[in-house]
């Protein structure tokens, strides 16, 4: 006698929506096998018997989870064989917030896998990587689970989300980040991916150490207008290790902005520069305290400023003003940084 | 300077509820994650709970859920913790920590202040 | 969530000597992890953050190593002043979880 379950394995996902066929069969010297399927929930698939074989179709819904046991027999001997049937939800519906990132801004990345099943974190990995590689330094939140609004009932898919809190993206930036999520199933791992690209930005020549938290500059007619685009802007480390700073500008399109540079080498000075054609001239409008109490040299495109007496620069914003034109930088520099430190 | 004050605790009884305060100076509260630590007479660290900078990401360790509330006033520079439903073993020192940028340890921690759940 | 085990949980030495602390981690934490003293009465002080990282201020005679899940704090040579309770810390993932806790007390 022979006793053969196709496919042979004793797990087997399906995957929501497909079918699947589980053939039973077995053959006897002695006359035709009796060949069935039992433990069988009602809505468990569909059976076709046939002599010496038994044909399981799983529909591929929710439902059709469960262990299944096929029994042959023939005379006085008998076999079975259990098949755990796995039905699975993963399709390619990853959603990822924010759209981009801003380098140099301590955010929080998050990244949801909807219409899942089975909702077992068990089952169901994220990780947020950089080229091939998990992102170092990467702290991730809670997950969050859901159950997804579905419009046809007894269909519970759930959606899970998980949150990271991103070191800085070093300089110059990646290109972008990627969310991925893996989903382990008896013999069978599928990933879906979702890119996070990260904003561009331009750096002064010497730039800092890739690890460590840097200066952030917003170009901008207004600083309330730049806020309000929805960047959350917020300081950066006021412990060290503290890089060579070297601010960050976005890149983007419209007038011609003024470039904010530090120079940590001549004490801490700012250099605000125009580089938009002649009869442009810069100038400094905002710094933290009394503008008053700096020292500043303004020769046409060129304004430097700087602390008096020499010492440690001042925590706060800073800004630069163009014209004509009237666009402007804004710079954040965080606190307790002193000059020649680093990493 | 950094630092941080906590303030609130006391004496309470078995399912009753208090408020601690940490009052925040020396640096730019609105920016920075801040944490709630506690520690029971005798024992080790146990984080409680977290709040992002804005107040829009929230978290809370197990045995607090749906007790505890944290919350922050950046405009007071101040850091909240609503305690309901006290139980005998949330007796601790609790102290309030904030968290670096970046790096996501505990760089500066208040003094703490004691709370103590008895009939 | 990651459990953190600290050994020994309490070791006796004398000023002058090496003293060395291990932390191990449950799963992989990569390098986040922070090493904090914490003498009676007063509040946690962090010594070192990102597994080897010096916290500014802190004397170079604390020294923290490791990456993973095995992390170790060195104490070159102790001091009257290091007499204290020292926790590790993992803040890969939330919950974040510390030690138990070492308490280095004088020989």
């Known amino acids: 006698q022979s006793f053969q379950v196709n496919p042979p394995e004793s797990e087997v996902a399906v995957a929501m929506g497909t079918s699947l066929q589980i053939t039973c069969s077995m053959s006897c010297d002695e006359g035709v096998a009796r060949v069935h399927w039992r433990g069988l929930d009602t809505s468990l698939g569909s059976v076709q018997t046939l002599p010496g074989s038994s044909i399981l179709s799983v529909r591929g819904m929710l439902s059709d989870t469960g262990t299944p046991v096929c029994v042959g027999s023939c005379g006085s001997r008998s076999f079975q064989h259990s098949v755990k049937i796995l039905v699975y939800a993963f399709p390619d519906q990853l959603v990822v917030s924010p759209e981009f990132l801003v380098p140099g801004q301590d955010q929080v990345v998050s990244c949801t896998a909807h219409n899942i099943w089975p909702a077992d974190p068990n089952s169901l990995s994220f990780a947020l990587l950089l080229g091939e590689q998990r992102l170092e330094g990467a702290q991730a939140l809670e997950p969050e689970q859901e159950e997804e609004i579905q419009e046809a009932e007894g269909t519970p898919l759930f959606r899970m989300t998980q949150r990271w809190r991103l070191p800085s993206l070093g300089t110059p930036a990646p290109p972008a980040l990627h969310c991925q999520v893996t989903m382990q199933l008896p013999k069978l791992v599928l990933t879906h991916r979702k890119e996070i690209p990260v904003l561009q930005s331009q750096t002064s020549p010497k730039p800092p150490n890739t690890t460590s938290a840097e200066p952030y500059i917003l170009t901008s007619s207004s600083t309330a207008e730049a806020v309000s685009t929805g960047l959350n802007i917020t300081t950066l480390p006021s412990a060290p290790p503290y890089p060579k700073l070297s601010p960050r500008t976005l890149s983007s399109e419209g007038p011609c902005r003024p470039k904010i540079h530090q120079d940590l080498e001549a004490g801490w000075e700012l250099l605000c520069e125009a580089s938009c054609g002649p009869g442009v001239t810069v100038r400094w409008t905002l710094a933290p305290g009394d503008l008053a109490t700096y020292h500043k040299r303004e020769a046409g495109a060129q304004a430097w400023l700087s602390v008096l007496p020499p010492g440690p620069m001042v925590e706060g914003w800073f800004q630069c003003r163009q014209d004509p034109g009237g666009e402007v930088t804004n710079l954040y520099v965080p606190g307790q940084v002193t000059p020649n430190s680093s990493s | 300077e950094v630092q941080l004050l906590e303030s609130g605790g006391g004496l309470v009884q078995p399912g009753g509820s208090l408020r601690l305060s940490c009052a925040a100076s020396g640096f730019t509260f609105s920016s920075y994650w801040m944490h709630w630590v506690r520690q029971a007479p005798g024992k080790g660290l146990e984080w409680v709970s977290y709040i992002s900078g804005s107040g829009g990401y929230t978290n809370y360790a197990d045995s607090v859920k749906g007790r505890f509330t944290i919350s922050r006033d950046n405009s007071k520079n101040t850091l909240y913790l609503q305690m309901n439903s006290l139980r005998a073993e949330d007796t601790a020192v609790y102290y309030c920590?904030?968290?670096?940028?970046?790096?996501?340890?505990?760089?500066?921690w208040g003094k703490g202040t004691t709370v103590t759940v008895s009939s | 969530d990651i459990q953190m085990t600290q050994s020994p949980s309490s070791l006796s030495a004398s000023v002058g000597d090496r003293v060395t602390i291990t932390c191990r981690a449950s799963q992989s934490i990569s390098s986040s992890l922070a090493w904090y003293q914490q003498k009676p009465g007063k509040a946690p002080k962090l010594l070192i953050y990102?597994?080897?990282s010096l916290q500014s201020g802190v004397p170079s005679r604390f020294s923290g190593s490791g990456s993973g899940t095995d992390f170790t704090l060195t104490i070159s040579s102790l001091q009257p002043e290091d007499f204290a309770t020292y926790y590790c810390?993992?803040?890969?993932?939330?919950?974040?979880?510390f030690g138990q806790g070492t308490k280095v007390e004088i020989k």
């Open positions: 920590a904030r968290d670096r940028p970046y790096y996501y340890d505990m760089d500066v």
């Open positions: 990102a597994a080897s």
């Open positions: 810390q993992q803040y890969k993932s939330y919950p974040v979880t």
